[in-house]
Interface confidence: medium
């Protein structure tokens, strides 16, 4: 609880907000959770605290970890945790699930795609927008403030949209990108019993102790917009929220993508600093819609290192 997942790419700016609610006038102290070492507030540091915000300018893969924020009001001290993961830049165009923000869906009448997390940054218009890594051009696309508007939305406008902007801090510029899926509501849709694409049932995934790992639960539910279509992870048959381990978190949003015209939903389970006890857990990917529930189980095993003589 009071732990929030944040992620970014190396060499980009990342700004994280303390997950505790409070007023901007409250004093907020930030610490590295592992060492309890205070994070400096001086802006000359690459990583520094600024009130409710923790700024990585720019971020490095080694910054990944859990950060503690203590919000000090006149009456209480409240503690929160920011679980930060910085990923290496992807060499190809493909944006992996774990870098995706929550999906938005649009229709002919309403086709706004908001740039995720942009309100945390000091940016100036216009935003740059890309679809499946191609820069958007043409009069149908209008970058307006912090969102993109698409005129005359069609089914093939569905896809992954990336916004790119520049964060300015004391005259220095840092690039930021954020990607989310956009789905188009199709009136002529239908729903099916859920089909789980990943993981395979009774799959085993090899992991390194001490490393981070991500498990993707992905299922398809039919064609077009679905009335009820949800995927979630369970640990030993319990909801993630009932499992009080801040290292293991399910991403907040669920990404909806269209694969061969099918409505598919993904959610990523992020496990930080894999421990031996994680190998004993049963990880269930649950897919649920009005037709019923399907469950695929995956377990973790220690990666075997093959020694060549």
């Amino acid at each position: 609880k009071f732990s929030k997942q944040s992620w970014g790419l190396e060499n980009e700016a990342l700004i994280v907000r303390c997950p505790r609610q409070g007023k901007s006038s409250y004093i907020v102290d930030w610490y590295y959770s592992q060492t309890n070492k205070s994070i400096p507030t001086q802006e000359r540091n690459r990583v520094f605290a600024s009130g409710q915000l923790l700024k990585f300018l720019p971020a490095e893969v080694a910054d990944s970890g859990i950060y503690t924020c203590i919000v000090r009001s006149p009456t209480f001290n409240r503690t929160g945790y920011a679980n930060v993961t910085i990923y290496k830049k992807q060499p190809d165009c493909n944006v992996p699930d774990y870098l995706m923000y929550s999906t938005v869906s649009g229709s002919e009448k309403n086709s706004k795609i908001y740039c995720p997390t942009i309100d945390l940054y000091n940016w100036t218009a216009p935003l740059e927008w890309f679809k499946n890594c191609q820069a958007l051009q043409g009069s149908r696309y209008k970058a307006h403030k912090s969102f993109l508007v698409i005129d005359n939305v069609m089914t093939d406008d569905a896809g992954d949209y990336t916004c790119k902007f520049i964060h300015n801090e004391n005259g220095a510029n840092y690039s930021v990108t954020a990607t989310r899926s956009f789905t188009v509501k199709d009136e002529q849709g239908f729903s099916l019993f859920p089909v789980i694409r990943a993981p395979a049932h009774n799959e085993t995934k090899e992991v390194e102790i001490g490393e981070n790992t991500n498990l993707t639960c992905s299922a398809c539910f039919g064609k077009g917009a679905q009335f009820l279509a949800t995927v979630q992870w369970q640990l030993n048959g319990n909801k993630i929220t009932d499992f009080s381990e801040p290292r293991i978190q399910q991403e907040e949003g669920q990404n909806q993508s269209f694969s061969n015209g099918l409505a598919c939903v993904n959610t990523v389970l992020r496990i930080a600093d894999v421990k031996e006890e994680d190998l004993l857990l049963r990880y269930d990917c649950l897919a649920l819609n009005l037709h019923g529930l399907r469950r695929h189980t995956i377990r973790l095993s220690r990666k075997h290192h093959h020694h060549h003589h």
């Epitope: 609880k1 009071f2 505790r20 609610q21 409070g22 007023k23 006038s25 409250y26 919000v71 009001s73 006149p74 009456t75 209480f76 409240r78 909801k239 929220t241 009932d242 009080s244």
Partner: antibody, heavy 117, light 106 residues
Framework: EVQLVQSGAEVKKPGATVKISCKVS????????MHWVQQAPGKGLEWMGR????????EYAEKFQGRVTITADTSTDTAYMELSSLRSEDTAVYYC??????????WGQGTLVTVSS | DIQMTQSPSSVSASVGDRVTITCITN??????IHWYQQKPGKAPKLLIY???TLRPGVPSRFSGSGSGTDFTLTISSLQPEDFATYYC????????FGQGTKLEIK
Amino acid sequence: EVQLVQSGAEVKKPGATVKISCKVSAFNIKDDYMHWVQQAPGKGLEWMGRIDPAIGNTEYAEKFQGRVTITADTSTDTAYMELSSLRSEDTAVYYCATGDFYAMAYWGQGTLVTVSS
Amino acid sequence: DIQMTQSPSSVSASVGDRVTITCITNTDIDDVIHWYQQKPGKAPKLLIYEGNTLRPGVPSRFSGSGSGTDFTLTISSLQPEDFATYYCLQSDNMLTFGQGTKLEIK
């Protein structure tokens, strides 16, 4: 020491509106949140809502939504709670309390509101 | 809405006794629970916040524990001034008080 002093007892007719004040001393009202709590005679405590006086943002409990209005005057360090369309079951002691977003630390002495025809 | 079930609704005990009051929620609220004491005709007083943090000036005989859905307020050795009504408060989603526990002299 932080003190919250509330206005005096009120007697109101059903359908009327009551407005209670809560003056804060030794504390800047803008620095924290102000909550209001209802307690009917012999009953438990019921949270009504809160305000961030610095910006005027309010949140209300579902039970009181539409009938309660919480305001604050930062120039006088005073918060107000107005309850409209009063009925007999609104007869209660009303407390103001300052705290952060999550809980109340310092409380007023309470204001008894009696609703009777 | 988050439902709070506080028990017992009343308890009789003697000075020196150990008393336990429980609050159970219908959903996981982690540690956003607070405990208040109220004496007749007086405003409530905060004892413990966020599950187990003792408010300054509150005697150490009061302690809070629990997480998730089950929370406990314990008074290790009752003193005469502890006879009062106790309320739990959750602030995970808006704020909700428990029904109260009246602690009376046996």
